[in-house]
């Protein structure tokens, strides 16, 4: 769920998600529309697709709580719990490391970006 994602992103990136990523650009945070603004925004768009796929699989993406271990900078998704819990962890792990990989191109001006400015084709999944 959201608590898992917030904790994981903070551990991996060192940034407080609520201050740095939710929202950011056109896809980080709730919802998403238009062309992603930068690599960080692309991470979130891909994560949205990951969640959309799990939703089509009947997973409760905001409610399911999963277990994982964070050690020496790495995330290990537990094989405990249901299939949905395990896949949700995999989606969140991917976005966390994607955000970390793109910290060097993070743009403060895209924090709280005005969503009506998010134009263009929304990328397909």
């Amino acid at each position: 769920g959201i608590l898992n994602l917030n904790k994981m992103v903070k551990q991996v990136t060192g940034k407080m998600p609520i201050l740095s990523y939710w929202p950011y650009g056109c896809h980080c945070g709730l919802g998403g529309r238009g062309q992603p603004k930068d690599a960080t925004d692309w991470c979130c768009q891909t994560h949205d697709c990951c969640y959309d796929h799990l939703k089509t699989q009947g997973c409760s993406i905001y409610k399911d709580y999963y277990r994982y271990n964070f050690s020496q900078g790495n995330i290990h998704c537990s094989d405990k719990g249901s299939w949905c819990e395990q896949q949700l962890c995999a989606c969140d792990k991917e976005v966390a490391f994607c955000l970390k990989r793109n910290l060097d191109t993070y743009q403060k001006r895209l924090r709280f970006y005005w969503r009506p400015h998010c134009r263009g084709q929304t990328p397909g999944c």
């Epitope: 699989q57 009947g58 997973c59 277990r67 094989d79 249901s82 299939w83 949905c84």
Partner: antibody, heavy 121, light 106 residues
């Protein structure tokens, strides 16, 4: 060789607390990834999953019974326990403990013989 | 929770006959698991991750399906196959079982 064996009171009165023990051999609950579930089956009816405990003491419960269930373990004695509070006649069933397979952690590969529990009004 | 509906509830088959037991999920699941149970015995693992046979299961058994529709098939019924078969999912919590299909020898 993996074996599990359940034990319980046999008969108890409505409103009492049911205490069950699963004694096992052939594996250790201190091994990473290991876990044991409790599953019950009323006579002539289907299976109902109740609870699961993992090697690291993480516990999962069936939401429909969660308020009445407590699962625990004694790793050194190779035992898993289940307590069900405020039982009534609907809790009459054969209770099984089961362990998932190494190769597929959602498949219960090993089952105990079951212990019949009868709740009288 | 995901409800698994098995059909038929009871069926009978003659030796050599092809048998198909169905398991329908109330919402999509990734895998299905099957168990065989005979009277007075504990359930035995039969099929895992939809189509893989558990150890010791005869090759005449097979499993298939996806989404909300899964099935267990016996290519040629034998006397020892008479039993109750249960499907199970752990796609999402809680883990649930179907009500069972009782297969009798005709």
């Amino acid at each position: 060789q993996v074996t599990l064996k359940e034990s319980g009171p046999g008969i108890l009165q409505s409103s009492q607390t049911l205490s069950l023990t699963c004694s096992f051999s052939g594996f250790s609950l201190s091994t990473s990834g290991m876990g044991v579930s409790w599953i019950r089956q009323p006579s002539g009816k289907g299976l109902e999953w109740l609870a699961h405990i993992y090697w690291d003491d993480d516990k999962r419960y069936n939401p429909s019974l969660k308020s009445r269930l407590t699962i625990s373990k004694d790793t050194s004695r190779n035992q898993v326990f289940l307590k069900i509070t405020s039982v009534d006649t609907a809790d009459t069933a054969t209770y099984y403990c089961a362990r998932p397979a190494y190769y597929s952690n959602h498949l219960f590969a090993y089952w105990g013989q079951g212990t019949l529990v009868t709740v009288s009004a | 929770q995901i409800v698994l509906t098995q059909s038929p509830a009871i069926m009978s088959a003659s030796p050599g006959e092809k048998v198909t037991i169905s398991c329908s999920a109330s919402s999509s699941v990734s895998y299905m698991y099957w168990y065989q149970q005979k009277p007075g015995s504990s359930p035995k693992p039969w099929i895992y991750r939809t189509s893989n046979l558990a150890s010791g299961v005869p090759a005449r058994f097979s499993g298939s399906g996806s989404g909300t529709s899964y099935s267990l098939t016996i290519s040629s019924m034998e006397a020892e196959d008479a039993a109750t078969y249960y499907c199970q999912q752990y796609h999402s919590s809680p883990l649930t079982f179907g009500a069972g299909t009782k297969l009798e020898l005709k």
